[in-house]
């Protein structure tokens, strides 16, 4: 508890739960300072005008902080970049522009899998190190935001929709839409 925001060494504020920033504007060179693409396109979708949707995964590296405390070691995780789109139309970095089906459903690239890691926090003033458990984003996926649910419900994209995921805690749909931060769990 108390991890409202993470701050890395470039003073980039990674919002706490409940705060979802808009992705940075499209740039031909970088997005979130991660470059050279992500994983190859995935999640085929059977649609009349779109053969495949792609979800860009960018990685980044940072130290986690909690107030004056800082992780003893840095971590690496993925950033799920913004809007999904047909793979054949995607630029190097996904912007907010919709190039197809303006009246169609809204697709978002959001965290899919997380990996739990334990990190040690070092605090100034001789305070004892603290151990925390974090959930780092391990993969991203496209989810469809339906207009039939007041734009609030994210649905799994592709064949996974009808398959319940065993052994995983349910994640509120609204939480994942733009969140790309490590999620902390109480680990005392």
């Amino acid at each position: 508890q108390g991890w409202q925001a993470f701050r890395n060494d470039a003073t980039e504020v990674i919002p706490g739960l409940g705060e979802y920033p808009e992705p940075p504007p499209e740039n031909n060179q970088t997005m979130n300072r991660a470059e050279n693409g992500g994983r190859p396109p995935h999640h085929p979708y059977d649609a009349k005008d779109v053969s495949e949707y792609s979800c860009r995964e960018l990685h980044y590296t940072r130290f986690l902080t909690d107030g004056p405390c800082r992780s003893a070691k840095p971590v690496t995780e993925l950033v799920c970049s913004g809007q999904c789109g047909p793979a054949r139309l995607l630029p190097n970095a996904i912007g907010r522009v919709k190039w197809w089906r303006p009246n169609g459903p809204d697709f978002r690239c959001i965290p899919d899998r997380y990996r739990a890691q334990r990190v040690q926090l070092l605090c100034p003033g001789g305070a004892a190190p603290r151990s925390r458990k974090v959930r780092l984003v391990a993969s991203c996926k496209c989810k469809r935001l339906t207009r039939f649910h007041n734009q609030s419900e994210l649905k799994d994209f592709g064949p996974e929709t009808a398959r319940p995921q065993k052994g995983r805690k349910p994640r509120p749909g609204a939480r994942g839409a733009k969140a790309n931060q490590a999620e902390l769990e109480n680990a005392y």
Epitope: A34, G37, T61, P74, T76
Partner: nanobody
Framework: EVQLVESGGGLVQAGGSLRLTCAAS????????IGWFRQAPGKQREVVAS???????YYEDSGKGRFTISRDNAKNRVYLQMNSLRPEDTAVYYC???????????WGQGTQVTVSS
């Protein structure tokens, strides 16, 4: 278990270039994310750049446009090409390895880079 050894550090004049090498031993090297970090005297260790097994790169603002990270999985090596060096780049440079979506748990011993004005 992956082990890392840095090399290529040294003394260089401002505006000069250096190429650091991180050599790894271990069969699973290619699956790790490799990062370069640095620590100047009296300061905290900070991120410089990192690269995934697939070649996706990340740069902190301090080295953006001047530093280039690359890797050769066949040789188990990761490189940091540093151009237009400045005195404030003086530090011990470390490479470290992390599993994807993980903590950088494996560290090299570091190589000293000194940039004189």
């Amino acid at each position: 278990e992956v082990q890392l050894v840095e090399s290529g550090g040294g003394l260089v004049q401002a505006g000069g270039s250096l190429r650091l090498t991180c050599a790894a031993s271990g069969r699973t090297f290619s699956s790790f994310v490799i990062g370069w970090f640095r620590q100047a005297p009296g300061k905290q260790r900070e991120v410089v750049a990192s690269i995934t097994s697939g070649g996706s790169t990340y740069y902190e603002d301090s080295g953006k446009g001047r530093f280039t990270i690359s890797r050769d999985n066949a040789k188990n090596r990761v490189y940091l090409q540093m151009n237009s060096l400045r005195p404030e780049d003086t530090a011990v440079y470390y490479c470290a390895a992390a599993e994807p979506a993980g903590v950088y748990d494996v560290w090299g011993q570091g190589t000293q880079v000194t940039v004189s004005s």
